[in-house]
């Protein structure tokens, strides 16, 4: 007999064909010989089956000798052998209905686990293979699990259920809730305004939750909460903010914080956490602030950086358009008795300048000017 695979909630067409290309009498029954539907002349008649309100046919195909049974909103328990009786013949079709669902919500936090569960009719022995949006294949039986979801797992998961050499495909949209970047670093000269942005890697209709930015200044012994805020339907409202520094926060997404001035005492690392309504766990983004200061005191020209710098970063002092006078993998460099002219302090990574501060050194009889 013919095997047809269906998906829970879907619509399926079971075909039945007569040799005569005209409308003749037919009827469909289930394995218990209960009539589902048939015809009486041109009228569609229905029997007392459980499918009554979900069974249909297509009158326009009867004239072609086709007498389909269409079952809408399929349920697992619709799995059965269906018999079409036409022209003193019986055609049997075995329908197997499968369902594939995500364990909980399809919106999961980065690092959480995804479990896909297959619902199948008794007596079936299907195999399942799923392909993630980044092309990773996972195989299993009744359940498939993926631990430690990553941002790249967001998107459509395509799962193929195989049974009796037939296959049925499911598509499940998974949204991994995370910030676009796990970590970011901002480089600023002393006194400059600092902008921190925390763009989300997903979009949802309504976004509600609360968040906080904790800051560990390099110079401080312990971390401190700089700001707490609420998020209601994508609208941001500040709950509490420290007096020093007095951060400002944008009212709309993406989450946006402004520090009026970059000062050495603020250099350090922050951790922004966002707890979303009806979700266990929090989203995290690390943010780092590196501050540079160039100063001239008497005969000493000094350049310093504060904050989390990598050991491979190079700090240099050079006179404009000349070779670097000093260049070290350290957080402070200086030049004694600097020549007059425009000096540049550069923080660079493999030749790429990350931060630059200029200071004008005047002839010895003058005082220095900082542009």
């Amino acid at each position: 007999k013919k095997v047809v695979l269906g998906k829970k909630g879907d619509t399926v067409e079971l075909t039945c064909t007569a040799s005569q290309k005209k409308s003749i009498q037919f009827h469909w029954k289930n394995s218990n010989q209960i009539k589902i539907l048939g015809n009486q002349g041109s009228f569609l008649t229905k029997g007392p089956s459980k499918l009554n309100d979900r069974a249909d046919s297509r009158r326009s195909l009867w004239d072609q000798g086709n007498f389909p049974l269409i079952i809408k909103n399929l349920k697992i328990e619709d799995s059965d052998t269906y018999i079409c009786e036409v022209e003193d013949q019986k055609e049997e079709v075995q329908l197997l209905v499968f369902g594939l669902t995500a364990n909980s919500d399809t919106h999961l936090l980065q690092g959480q686990s995804l479990t896909l569960t297959l619902e199948s009719p008794p007596g079936s022995s299907p195999s399942v293979q799923c392909r993630s949006p980044r092309g990773k294949n996972i195989q299993g039986g009744k359940t498939l699990s993926v631990s430690q979801l990553e941002l790249q797992d967001s998107g459509t998961w395509t799962c193929t259920v195989l049974q009796n050499q037939k296959k049925v495909e499911f598509k499940i949209d998974i949204v991994v809730l995370a910030f676009q970047k796990a970590s970011s670093i901002v480089y600023k000269k002393e006194g400059e305004q600092v902008e921190f942005s925390f763009p989300l890697a997903f979009t949802v209709e309504k976004l509600t939750g609360s968040g906080e930015l904790w800051w560990q200044a390099e110079r401080a012994s312990s971390s401190k909460s700089w700001i707490t805020f609420d998020l209601k339907n994508k609208e941001v409202s500040v709950k509490r903010v420290t007096q020093d520094p007095k951060l400002q926060m944008g009212k709309k997404l993406p989450l946006h914080l402004t520090l009026p001035q970059a000062l050495p005492q603020y250099a350090g690392s922050g951790n922004l956490t966002l707890a979303l309504e009806a979700k266990t766990g929090k989203l995290h983004q690390e943010v780092n602030l590196v501050v540079m200061r160039a100063t001239q005191l008497q005969k000493n020209l000094t350049c310093e950086v504060w904050g989390p710098t990598s050991p491979k970063l190079m700090l240099s002092l050079k006179l404009e358009n000349k070779e670097a006078k000093v260049s070290k993998r350290e957080k402070a460099v200086w030049v004694l008795n600097p020549e007059a002219g425009m000096w540049q302090c550069l923080l660079s990574d493999s030749g790429q300048v990350l931060l630059e501060s200029n200071i004008k050194v005047l002839p010895t009889w003058s005082t220095p000017v900082q542009p």
Epitope: D10, T11, G41, S42, F43, D56, R59, S60
Partner: antibody, heavy 115, light 107 residues
Framework: QVQLQQWGAGLLKPSETLSLTCAVY????????WSWIRQPPGKGLEWIGE???????NYNPSLKSRVTISVVTSKNQFSLKLSSVTAADTAVYYC?????????WGQGTLVTVSS | DIQMTQSPSSVSASVGDRVTITCRAS??????LAWYQQKPGKAPKLLIY???SFQSGVPSRFSGSGSGTDFTLTISSLQPEDFATYFC?????????FGQGTKLEIK
């Protein structure tokens, strides 16, 4: 909830080929037939043809020689091509889901044939 | 092809009126008939199928009846949002065909 979204060129010259595509979002694609219907300005509705997920088609005999309906099941999309258009093919073209009745419908695309 | 003929082609009525639109098929179509409502610039909307079954969400003031060749759509008490064009459609055989439409206007 099933939604149909259609697109295609809105202005054609006589003898050109009309080409429209309809995407189906939500619901079952495989269990239904997918139709094209047109409505000339201020006039009634004319059924053009239909296709199912496996590519089985039925066409209106009055247009059959010029019509091709195709399907891309992987994208839940189906398309209409109508060749050698004339001014008489100017109409709003609709896509729709069908078993026996048309429901739901796409938003419609006005196609004007003019030299 | 089965011809579907609607009458009248237009009708003027007032809010609260009872309105009946008829559709005649050129041959027996049993109960394979649907009714649609269309407002200007919009796609048609299914109201009644299988001659007398309500599509979900359709107000109960709409009803359909008939079998064979003669069918009626009745609106028991016209509401302002009911002023539109109504079409019948047969699903008995290919090609599917529609009536020419009945325009329901405010008196």
């Amino acid at each position: 909830q099933v939604q149909l979204q259609q697109w295609g060129a809105g202005l054609l010259k006589p003898s050109e080929t009309l080409s429209l595509t309809c995407a189906v979002y939500g619901g079952s694609f495989s269990g239904y037939y997918w139709s094209w219907i047109r409505q000339p300005p201020g006039k009634g509705l004319e059924w053009i043809g239909e296709i199912n997920h496996s590519g089985s088609t039925n066409y209106n005999p009055s247009l059959k020689s010029r019509v091709t309906i195709s399907v891309v099941t992987s994208k839940n999309q189906f398309s209409l091509k109508l060749s050698s258009v004339t001014a008489a093919d100017t109409a709003v073209y609709y896509c729709a889901r069908v078993l026996n009745w048309f429901d739901p419908w796409g938003q419609g695309t006005l196609v004007t044939v003019s030299s | 092809d089965i011809q579907m003929t609607q009458s009248p082609s237009s009708v003027s009525a007032s809010v609260g009126d009872r309105v009946t639109i008829t559709c005649r098929a050129s041959q027996d179509i049993a109960d394979w008939l649907a009714w649609y409502q269309q407002k200007p610039g919009k796609a048609p909307k299914l109201l009644i199928y299988a001659a007398s079954s309500f599509q979900s969400g359709v107000p109960s003031r709409f009803s359909g009846s008939g079998s064979g060749t003669d069918f009626t759509l009745t609106i028991s008490s016209l509401q302002p949002e009911d002023f539109a064009t109504y079409f019948c459609q047969q699903a008995n055989s290919f090609p599917y065909t529609f009536g020419q439409g009945t325009k329901l206007e405010i008196k």
